[in-house]
Amino acid sequence: VSPTFQVVNSIAPVQECSTQLDIVIVLDGSNSIYPWDSVTAFLNDLLERMDIGPKQTQVGIVQYGENVTHEFNLNKYSSTEEVLVAAKKIVQRGGRQTMTALGIDTARKEAFTEARGARRGVKKVMVIVTDGESHDNHRLKKVIQDCEDENIQRFSIAILGSYNRGNLSTEKFVEEIKSIASEPTEKHFFNVSDELALVTIVKTLGERIFALEAT
């Protein structure tokens, strides 16, 4: 051993996912999502587990409600730290309508293009977070099939907050969001009681996303 050898304290990285994936997170930003910082906390906890970079995992975020906004593209940031800073700054765009089919279709057609950073041969993953039945659900079946045709793996998360606040039945909503998830549904669909509970699914969601690279 060299005489200059010394022990240096090292910190184990938070990242658990050092795989190559192109992940687009599709966020419902309509008014009924409350409080919004529960969503940004969820994003933070999920993203800090990822090893983000041009040769590792890339993340893009799309927000929808009445219309769709690309918050940032897959190739916008080249490190986990940069993505965490950007995700924290995402503001809720509001709106009363929940155009989920439009959000998913825009992510498929636009966010997953090479122009926005998608890489050929890299597995595509979409994470959809919403709290209400879509106002364009007549389009949902075709939109999901289009994603399926393009081999986009879909994880869907149903937030039951607005239903519980209004003492409304969640049955129809849960069925719709389950229909968005890839098969097997039980591994791709999550539901949480309210927005505050989003952080409780991060570990499991992260593990299931990262497991995709092994399949």
């Epitope: 309509s30 008014n31 009924s32 409350y34 409080p35 919004w36 409600g65 009445e66 503001v91 809720q92 765009r93 509001g94 709106g95 009363r96 607005s162 606040r165 209004g166 409304l168 309210d194 505050l196």
Partner: antibody, heavy 124, light 108 residues
Framework: EVQLVQSGAEVKKPGESLRISCKGS????????IGWVRQMPGKGLEWMGI????????RYSPSFQGQVTISADKSISTAYLQWSSLKASDTAMYYC??????????????????WGQGTLVTVS | EIVLTQSPGTLSLSPGERATLSCRAS???????LAWYQQKPAQAPRLLIY???RRATGIPDRFSGSGSGTDFTLTISRLEPEDFAVYYC?????????FGQGTTVEIK
């Protein structure tokens, strides 16, 4: 930068009509509810009602139902509070505020994150 | 409707001291949907805390909120000169917004 800018102070006589305004900027004004809050001289805050400028859906506090009218013109990102016949007891500071939350179906919830500077209405 | 009662009505303290403001609801506030606002003379209210304990953007960490159900507290750990003002609590869990009557924090 999110801003709510209210119209200037008004001095009116009892029985007169009045409309005050609140113009939003720096965010998608048609996508957030706007509330109105009254503060009588030396007193606390009272919620009056709320409107969604995107489609003018409106809810009123029972205490103010029938006493005032809340409206909006989404083309100019402005919400209004109006009286058809003012009373001396309407003398107060009136604030508009943006709701971070929702008011769909039977449930309303959320906090007011941005406020206008206030419009003082004096009726005497 | 839910009635909010704030206490004390007035709190006389010196800069650097700790301020504890109480807000009690006549019935349980659902999902801890309670906010705190600060209002200075001739100014609009300013959001401090929402969902009982979450600090609004730009609010210093000397302000903290706690509580659930019917009892809520706003704490200012060390009073700064600019903190002397009126503080209102507000509930929003019942399709209506109601405010407490306010607590005045004044310089001793």
């Amino acid at each position: 930068e999110v801003q709510l800018v209210q119209s200037g102070a008004e001095v009116k006589k009892p029985g007169e009509s009045l409309r005050i305004s609140c113009k939003g900027s720096g965010y998608s004004v048609t996508s957030y509810w706007i509330g109105w809050v009254r503060q009588m001289p030396g007193k606390g805050l009272e919620w009056m009602g709320i409107i969604y400028p995107g489609d003018s859906d409106t809810r009123y506090s029972p205490s103010f139902q029938g006493q005032v009218t809340i409206s909006a013109d989404k083309s100019i990102s402005t919400a209004y509070l109006q009286w058809s016949s003012l009373k001396a007891s309407d003398t107060a500071m009136y604030y508009c505020a943006r709701l971070q939350g929702d008011c769909s179906g039977g449930t309303c919830y959320g906090h007011f994150d941005y406020w206008g500077q206030g419009t003082l209405v004096t009726v005497s | 409707e839910i009635v909010l009662t704030q206490s004390p009505g007035t709190l006389s303290l010196s800069p650097g001291e700790r301020a504890t403001l109480s807000c009690r609801a006549s019935q349980s506030v659902s999902s801890s949907y309670l906010a705190w606002y600060q209002q200075k003379p001739a100014q609009a209210p300013r959001l401090l805390i929402y969902v009982a304990s979450r600090r609004a953007t730009g609010i210093p960490d000397r302000f903290s909120g706690s509580g659930s159900g019917t009892d809520f507290t706003l704490t200012i750990s060390r009073l700064e000169p600019e903190d002397f003002a009126v503080y209102y609590c507000q509930q929003y869990g019942t399709s209506s917004w109601t405010f407490g009557q306010g607590t005045t924090v004044e310089i001793k």
